[in-house]
Interface confidence: medium
Amino acid sequence: WELTILHTNDVHSRLEQTSEDSSKCVNASRCMGGVARLFTKVQQIRRAEPNVLLLDAGDQYQGTIWFTVYKGAEVAHFMNALRYDAMALGNHEFDNGVEGLIEPLLKEAKFPILSANIKAKGPLASQISGLYLPYKVLPVGDEVVGIVGYTSKETPFLSNPGTNLVFEDEITALQPEVDKLKTLNVNKIIALGHSGFETDKLIAQKVRGVDVVVGGHSNTFLYTGNPPSKEVPAGKYPFIVTSDDGRKVPVVQAYAFGKYLGYLKIEFDERGNVISSHGNPILLNSSIPEDPSIKADINKWRIKLDNYSTQELGKTIVYLDGSSQSCRFRECNMGNLICDAMINNNLRHADEMFWNHVSMCILNGGGIRSPIDERNNGTITWENLAAVLPFGGTFDLVQLKGSTLKKAFEHSVHRYGQSTGEFLQVGGIHVVYDLSRKPGDRVVKLDVLCTKCRVPSYDPLKMDEIYKVILPNFLANGGDGFQMIKDELLRHDSGDQDINVVSTYISKMKVIYPAVEGRIKFS
Amino acid sequence: WELTILHTNDVHSRLEQTSEDSSKCVNASRCMGGVARLFTKVQQIRRAEPNVLLLDAGDQYQGTIWFTVYKGAEVAHFMNALRYDAMALGNHEFDNGVEGLIEPLLKEAKFPILSANIKAKGPLASQISGLYLPYKVLPVGDEVVGIVGYTSKETPFLSNPGTNLVFEDEITALQPEVDKLKTLNVNKIIALGHSGFETDKLIAQKVRGVDVVVGGHSNTFLYTGNPPSKEVPAGKYPFIVTSDDGRKVPVVQAYAFGKYLGYLKIEFDERGNVISSHGNPILLNSSIPEDPSIKADINKWRIKLDNYSTQELGKTIVYLDGSSQSCRFRECNMGNLICDAMINNNLRHADEMFWNHVSMCILNGGGIRSPIDERNNGTITWENLAAVLPFGGTFDLVQLKGSTLKKAFEHSVHRYGQSTGEFLQVGGIHVVYDLSRKPGDRVVKLDVLCTKCRVPSYDPLKMDEIYKVILPNFLANGGDGFQMIKDELLRHDSGDQDINVVSTYISKMKVIYPAVEGRIKFS
């Protein structure tokens, strides 16, 4: 008979997903854990496997603003939603005193909460009676499984359990409860508790009749094989302890903060002996989607703690570097992307002599106002593009003489190094600057993509030739000091909205990956 | 109890018979393979022997126009007709995404399709549930045989499985499934899968309870005795691996392209131990007649292919210069187009440290066999592309040291000027040659596009670094004198059909206009 034990411990109010280091989630595409994601994985396993228990080994309480505000009500609510089968009391469950445990959690939980080594006395005894139990027998498929709980006997030094709870030695307290389970013909027994890995191992060794130990408190990470994240395993999962009576007892723990879901498969024979055990903690990373209903509930609870433009147009798999540190000093891939979109938006194959009417683009680096980070699942939205191109301009078509273009490129670097906006990004142009030369004579090579050709290739710019160029209306109008364009242009046709040009291109391409490819060089 | 395992792998849509080198059949009297011939041999063995399984180890998808047009429907139809007993998923089964696997194949196959190490998550989990299985127990005569599947964990880098499939380590995933089969009293277990010969051997060594491994992916040819055709055996058939628990586990593979039918006879004892194994791949040459009914069906399906090859895939507004006068002497825009398509076909954004796993392409100019004229309304058809790439090759992924790449570029121009095919076209590479220098020392600049970067840009090639490169299988196998690639490559994964890669890119782009942009220069 095979049992799947899913287990968490030391979740410490990480109800929402977190960064890899279990701090506040910043970059959602790299975030981990959280109850919505945990539920997805638990449900997946419940659907796939017949005999599943979901257990928590304590210390759900304490750790984020969630606990500060909701004081444990959030624990009961979301653990109920996830249909936990049992929980052991951890030391932090007493952080708000016994009342802070009884009211929000013990009275609201729809699952048994356990500890065999906590004994109530005085007036508390009757008040807390039945709200937590030493053990619980759970039906699982056609079998029954006994769960016996324990809590660190150090809790009075670690939390606020008050004077009416006695924390006994774990092993001393557990043995009679296990013996009782045996007399009830329960032959499969899990010790679930919160005393740390060393105590977990001692329980496995010393408590006769315990088949499996599921622990917490020490945030122990166990793993068999190559670990999937940054945690270094303290041993194999499960950690096998040979009991004093010669049995192999698997001991497990699942690190902390809901980053992993412990996954242990146990095979029992007909007499309840463990005949095999294997598994591993499952890293709850972003490859596991967050369950939408739980996520919605989280978002609803979240309020108390604190449409086109947001839709995805396409994806980037590279960082779109629209920073002024790049685009005002050197070729930047955001500039290349925008220029490529501008050319693509102007394909007009009208004549067999010309592959296209225009092949060149120039774009003032200062007009690129923001980068786009690819680490948001690569998503690019209109909102993102509006930050890059916030001025609501157009991308226009002009006709210029080669000599005008040469002047424009000299202007591009006439006061290079001062982070000024006139530094030109390009498409269909290869330019080489020599900054050691005097301003006005720094362009040492200027090759442009032919249009009157069947195979586009680069030829030196001819001063007297007339070229078509796509550029922002801002430049056509002489902006950023490009007076020569305004003064010398031979024709100017206003074009499409800048954001629209780029968004259309991205939608068409679906996935983009512009490079810095040597359009602009310095000799 | 004796079992006959008939097996194929890496058939790559060779539904029709092929030439001896697995390219298009020219002289029918000397052609080999094809499903009609395969069926004849399978039926002959089924009639002669009592306990026969016909298995496929993946990569039926991708390789000829059959796949381009029928998108997997042809695989389901003809594998059903041949009454395959089981198939493992290969990486290429995901080339058209998960939908392209589910609809034509998973939903239509009358045989189980297997993979134990692919786990579905998110919305896909319920959609794909039951359509592929980790294992299947097949009745064979009076016995049962468990078949457990596996797929290369590199699939996310080699194909398009999307984000809702997790490819686990093969051994880690297989063990629990094999254990489950054991608990079901299945004592004869075949691991059928697609991860390459090295992994096949590891599975045989490490996965307790696997009796036989039937593999694919590496196109491994094994043979005992004198081989019957041009393939050189990598070892004896079966290849015997001693498992960690001391069993002798036969491992087999049957080359590729349906040229051979693997034939393995296994003798099991009453406890399901393999006590003997022997066999050999059977060369499906013209001495085996094609089955008339299957052949008639093939001819019926063929009609749609002829129609497809004349339909427009997309348009070019430039002349696609695939002339030998250009591509064997200098950068040609047909070479750029093909390399750009090769990179685009290999976008697998798996890791934030890397914008992509591969950025470089090389392509022997001699492999470009025709230009495409844009003056036919710009139309590009499959027929046009088949003239450019007539050899039915694949565009493969290799790992090479920088020093090997440097040797390859020296070889590219070692006898420059004689119109020889080894002149390399490139993508993600900027190379400068000085032909005045002596052969072997002509590469004066070799810059390559970074992958471990968020903004792709060009850096000098490092001799000791390992790079991934996309190239034709012809080059990976040392063709055109590129012996250094064959001898020094560190990894080789076969890729998609060459024409299919370019046609998909053109269909996606709709309008293309590749330029000669300075990737290859002469100083």
Epitope: - | T224, I240, D245, G246, R247, K248, E267, D269, R271, N273, V274, I275, S276, S277, H278
Partner: antibody
Framework: EVQLQQSGPELVKPGASVKVSCKAS????????MNWVKQSHGKSLDWIGY????????SYNLTFKGKATLTVDKSSTTAYMHLNSLTSEDSAVYYC?????????????WGQGTLVTVSA | SIVMTPTPKFLLVSAGDRVTITCKAS??????VAWYQQKPGQSPKLLIY???TRYTGVPDRFTGSGYGTDFTFTISTVQAEDLAVYFC????????FGAGTKLELK
């Protein structure tokens, strides 16, 4: 049905040699190693070695290297053991034996044995 | 080479007895152990392989167990036709037989 039929008893003089045959039938001869085992009178069993009929490759117990030579004739599905420089120590019953399978040497099929007596 | 040492060398039995023979390997041989029965004037017969797997047609009163260096062969209820010599054999490294245990009638 698998059968191994050995040649008859041999009486040979010291220093001479002898060739014992083992005719196999009822199975694919080339697919299974043929092993040879010595049993001295009233004693245990000693493995001599095996030959792989497929390719003629052989493996010997070091004790018998130089003493025994194993050969096969695939066309007649017969295995042979040649013993040379015989002494009284070589007097024994010699068995050919085939494994249950071709991996592990579990001898499921045995010849009837050939008695070799070395005597002046 | 690996030495297989059986215990005892002789065993006097009556019909219906339970008989256990052990065989100790001089080093670990995993479970690569077989047991044979040989009657006078006959070739040996394979009874057990892989230490515990009964060969086809062998009655279930014959069982084997063990792993590593210590192996046991048991006849649960001896019958008259079981009187014979029993050999253990390892093929973990090269191939060696034990000296044999002779079952005789009391």
């Amino acid at each position: 049905e698998v059968q191994l039929q050995q040649s008859g008893p041999e009486l040979v003089k010291p220093g001479a040699s002898v060739k014992v045959s083992c005719k196999a039938s009822g199975y694919a001869f080339a697919s299974y190693n043929m092993n040879w085992v010595k049993q001295s009178h009233g004693k245990s069993l000693d493995w001599i070695g095996y030959i792989d009929p497929y390719n003629g490759g052989s493996s010997y117990n070091l004790t018998f290297k130089g003493k025994a030579t194993l050969t096969v004739d695939k066309s007649s599905t017969t295995a042979y053991m040649h013993l040379n420089s015989l002494t009284s120590e070589d007097s024994a019953v010699y068995y050919c034996a085939r494994g249950y399978g071709n991996y592990k040497a579990w001898f499921a099929y045995w010849g009837q044995g050939t008695l070799v007596t070395v005597s002046a | 080479s690996i030495v297989m040492t059986p215990t005892p060398k002789f065993l006097l039995v009556s019909a219906g007895d339970r008989v256990t023979i052990t065989c100790k390997a001089s080093q670990s041989v995993s479970n690569d152990v077989a047991w044979y029965q040989q009657k006078p004037g006959q070739s040996p017969k394979l009874l057990i392989y892989y230490a515990s797997t009964r060969y086809t047609g062998v009655p279930d009163r014959f069982t084997g167990s063990g792993y590593g260096t210590d192996f046991t062969f048991t006849i649960s209820t001896v019958q008259a036709e079981d009187l014979a010599v029993y050999f253990c054999q390892q093929d973990y490294s090269s191939l060696t037989f034990g000296a044999g245990t002779k079952l005789e009638l009391k």
